[in-house]
């Protein structure tokens, strides 16, 4: 079948999800496409515990997550509600800064060197994290 009951090689399992941590950089859209090619998505952070887990693995390096406001409001790539969900922005962020001189504002969110979030130009080649959930069917206890 197509059920994913365990994490692929080189992925890290944590709380019924699998995570893969890149060691190179891509623009946000290319990182998003890469994760989708792996039947996954850019990481969606839903709790302080998950934040600490990801932060531990990426270290002090700018790293894309699956959060953007390219179409207006901030949205998580898997549909998780942004307004009611976990947030960990740096002070004064997001600021949609236009002063970088690259054209436009800042529409994609990343982990900064201290783990807190910042919005930045989506074309910057940052590292990224993919996440995929283990199948719900596989989480049910076996019938006796």
């Amino acid at each position: 079948g197509s059920e994913r009951t365990c994490c692929p090689v080189n992925w890290v399992e944590h709380e019924r999800s699998c995570y893969w941590f890149s060691r190179s950089g891509k623009a946000w859209a290319d990182a998003d496409n890469y994760c989708r090619l792996e039947d996954a998505h850019l990481v969606v952070v839903t709790s302080w515990e998950e934040q600490k887990f990801v932060q531990h693995h990426i270290g002090p390096v700018n790293t894309w997550m699956g959060l953007h406001d390219q179409n207006g409001p901030w949205k998580w790539v898997d549909g998780t509600d942004y307004e009611t969900g976990f947030k960990n922005w740096r002070p004064e962020q997001p600021d949609d800064w236009y002063g970088h001189g690259l054209g436009g504002g800042e529409d994609c969110a990343h982990f900064t060197d201290d783990g807190r979030w910042n919005d930045d130009v989506c074309q910057r080649p940052y590292r990224w994290v993919c996440e995929t959930e283990l199948d719900k069917a596989s989480q049910e206890p076996p019938l006796l």
Epitope: P8, V9, N10, W11, S22, S24, N33, E38
Partner: antibody
Framework: EVQVLESGGGLVQPGGSLRLSCAAS????????MSWVRQAPGKGLEWVSA????????YYADAVKGRFTISRDNSKNTLYLQMNSLRAEDTAVYYC????????????????WGQGTLVTVSS | DIQMTQSPSSLSASVGDRVTITCRAS??????LGWYQQKPGKAPKRLIY???SLQSGVPSRFSGSGSGTEFTLTISSLQPEDFATYYC?????????FGGGTKVEIK
């Protein structure tokens, strides 16, 4: 040994349809994204389409978007390319190819190719 | 789309020569680049992946270098079986794009 074998090519009239197949063996098919690449007679290589291992995501070159559909049947270890509204410029040898993962788990495209199947679009 | 400009489009060389082929990307692609060899009527064969990693089973006279926008394939000592067409491929961004090819012919 990794093997991919294309089939389904042939002569078709402009506006017609054709479905290519690629039978894979020697690796865990569902764990790998797969691609189609084509080569017009006497020309260079052109990437056509890609699909994720479980089929959840697909990607297309602009030249074929809306006309070609990539799919896979992991129970049969087979990749497909459904080609509709064919044009003379689609005439090419079509190759099926898989990628590989490096030691960090990063995917690199196109390490094993089939021998190709020729599609000729002509009236 | 990322354009891959490959040069030269053709070259003539002798057995034992050192041959260098270049690919230039229209924007940075990190090291998401492979090099392929194709002989007439045959499927392409990957020689190099990740810009500089040698594919298993490929002779060590083939090497790749570069990162970002400039990449090079070098054949340190050309052998008779190396006369073929060579292509680069970038996979940093969709659509994937190939260079136009370099035909290596016998002088």
């Amino acid at each position: 040994e990794v093997q991919v074998l294309e089939s389904g090519g042939g002569l078709v009239q402009p506006g017609g349809s054709l479905r290519l197949s690629c039978a894979a063996s020697g690796f865990t098919f569902s764990s790998y994204a797969m691609s189609w690449v084509r080569q017009a007679p006497g020309k260079g290589l052109e990437w056509v389409s890609a699909i994720s291992g479980r089929g959840g995501s697909t990607y297309y070159a602009d030249a074929v978007k809306g006309r070609f559909t990539i799919s896979r049947d992991n129970s049969k270890n087979t990749l497909y390319l459904q080609m509709n509204s064919l044009r003379a410029e689609d005439t090419a040898v079509y190759y099926c190819a898989k990628g590989s993962y490096d030691s960090s788990g990063y995917y690199h495209y196109l390490d094993h190719w089939g021998q190709g199947t020729l599609v000729t679009v002509s009236s | 789309d990322i354009q891959m400009t490959q040069s030269p489009s053709s070259l003539s060389a002798s057995v034992g020569d050192r041959v260098t082929i270049t690919c230039r990307a229209s924007q940075g692609i990190e090291n998401d680049l492979g090099w392929y060899q194709q002989k007439p009527g045959k499927a392409p064969k990957r020689l190099i992946y990740a810009a500089s990693s040698l594919q298993s089973g490929v002779p060590s006279r083939f090497s790749g270098s570069g990162s970002g926008t400039e990449f090079t394939l070098t054949i340190s000592s050309l052998q008779p079986e190396d006369f073929a067409t060579y292509y680069c491929l970038q996979h940093n961004s969709y659509p994937l794009t190939f260079g136009g090819g370099t035909k290596v012919e016998i002088k």
